[in-house]
Interface confidence: low
Amino acid sequence: EEELQVIQPDKSISVAAGESATLHCTVTSLIPVGPIQWFRGAGPGRELIYNQKEGHFPRVTTVSDLTKRNNMDFSIRISNITPADAGTYYCVKFRKGSPDHVEFKSGAGTELSVRAKPSAPVVSGPAARATPQHTVSFTCESHGFSPRDITLKWFKNGNELSDFQTNVDPAGDSVSYSIHSTAKVVLTREDVHSQVICEVAHVTLQGDPLRGTANLSETIRVPPTLEVTQQPVRAENQVNVTCQVRKFYPQRLQLTWLENGNVSRTETASTLTENKDGTYNWMSWLLVNVSAHRDDVKLTCQVEHDGQPAVSKSHDLKVSAHPKEQGSNTAPGPALASAAPL
């Protein structure tokens, strides 16, 4: 009679994580008597996966009824597959022995590869804000996928970026893999509403890539431009001085008026006007009583934006240009009349 053969028809199978894997095995003879065992891996360190005669294997079921006298199908089904189940599985026939069974013949093995979806990409930007024209780095991470092949792309407002570096770890074989990518983005003044997108494509996603996003509003700081102007007002000897603070982001802003270098008033920005590009405008004004001054006045609008060093703009108020009251017995009014912002 022809010697028993152990036939594993599938050289490899690929299963999605969470599904069941069926490993096929048939023998060509009922002789010699002895059990079938399934192992993952070969050699001394191999792992017992299923033993026909003994053991507790809750995730493993047999495809056919092994209690049938003439059964020669020893295929098994492993439920709830995870990436940790990847490997080569061997169906091994043992010959009955005492005290131990003796290995008789092994199948050629079936390689099980597990397809596991990558986790949702997480995009993170720099810890500190940066100003337009600066280059900032964004990182994108995704984990737990298998097989190793994966595609990662970066976009800014739908435009694909090219300045990035990507690594897939580990370099060698593993049950699952992680991807880490760093992209460089040059900021512009118009980026408050911009988004950076990391897109990951993998065989398990069936053409529907995963995306992670970062809003540049959390990264960018647009410093303000200042303009100080004066307009006469109807009341004699009074001038209205305004400080226009334009195109800044984020909102956090404090403004200080100085009169000849001395602090006159400090206020925090409120009631801002938002521009289409996401930046803000604000205006503060002062009423200056020129009759209280004998000499020219230097007015300075000083702005501290988002904790950064102050920027300022000055305006020289020419006192001589305004007629002074002659012979007035009344005490002069305050040089600077406090006024709420418009």
């Epitope: 059990p35 065992q37 993952r40 792992e47 017992l48 996966i49 033993n51 005669k53 003994e54 053991g55 507790h56 294997f57 809750p58 995730r59 940790a84 189940d85 043992f94 005290p99 131990d100 069974h101």
Partner: antibody, heavy 116, light 110 residues
Framework: QSVEESGGRLVTPGTPLTLTCTVS????????MHWVRQAPGKGLEWIGI?????ATSYATWAKGQFTISKTSTTVDLKITSPTTEDTATYFC?????????????WGPGTLVTVSL | QIVMTQTPFSVSAVVGGTVTIKCQAS??????LAWYQQKPGQRPKLLIY???TLASGVSSRFKGSGSGTEFTLTISGVESADAATYYC????????????FGGGTEVVVK
């Protein structure tokens, strides 16, 4: 029905050591056997199992460091190349069924000390 | 791989009181869970298996409950002899596991 470990002693790192578990009152052809260890002041750590048919399985950390084998009345645990981290009391325990599930008979343990 | 996490690390009890120890499995293990008691210098002793079945000769003051991933050991009417370390153990499967036992909970009886 009982099990008892022996062979524990002081060894230097790298010196192979074999511990033996002797069973009485039951047959190793009906019950799987386990080895479990416990480092001083630490918890229980499962090492591996030998089934009635002689097949073995090991904890992921124990593969290559330990080998389990048996005769008709004894189960051996070989520590291939001990390190100081292997200092522990080693227990053998009987499975409550012919396969893996629970441990219902334990030996008193044997102490292995690995030191220079 | 299945990881067993036990809480708390240590618990203090008064004689006659009640102690609750929790064990969490990282995967669904059905009812394949056992509890062991180990006193200092002694071998572990099987208390409960299949999550809630008392082992032979074990006092009914010990009660196991739970299934899936969350399990509880309750000791009622605590006695001074209950001072020990208690371990949970998954009996679900040993392919690719690091350890089948939880980290242990020390019960101190005052």
């Amino acid at each position: 029905q009982s099990v008892e470990e022996s062979g524990g002693r002081l060894v230097t790192p790298g010196t192979p050591l074999t511990l033996t578990c002797t069973v009485s009152g039951f047959s190793l052809s009906n019950y799987a056997m386990h080895w479990v260890r416990q480092a001083p002041g630490k918890g229980l750590e499962w090492i591996g199992i030998i089934y009635t048919g002689g097949a073995t399985s090991y904890a992921t950390w124990a593969k290559g460091q330990f080998t389990i084998s048996k005769t008709s009345t004894t189960v051996d645990l070989k520590i291939t190349s001990p390190t100081t981290e292997d200092t522990a009391t080693y227990f053998c325990a009987r499975g409550d069924r012919d396969g893996y599930a629970y441990f219902n008979i334990w030996g008193p343990g044997t102490l292995v000390t690995v030191s220079l | 791989q299945i990881v067993m996490t036990q809480t708390p690390f240590s618990v203090s009890a008064v004689v006659g009181g009640t102690v609750t120890i929790k064990c969490q499995a990282s995967h669904n293990i059905g009812s394949w869970l056992a509890w062991y008691q180990q006193k200092p210098g002694q071998r572990p002793k099987l208390l409960i298996y299949d999550a809630s079945t008392l082992a032979s000769g074990v006092s009914s003051r010990f009660k196991g409950s739970g299934s899936g991933t969350e399990f509880t050991l309750t000791i009622s009417g605590v006695e001074s002899a209950d001072a020990a370390t208690y371990y949970c153990q998954q009996g679900y499967g040993i392919s690719y596991v690091h350890n089948v036992f939880g980290g242990g909970t020390e019960v101190v009886v005052k």
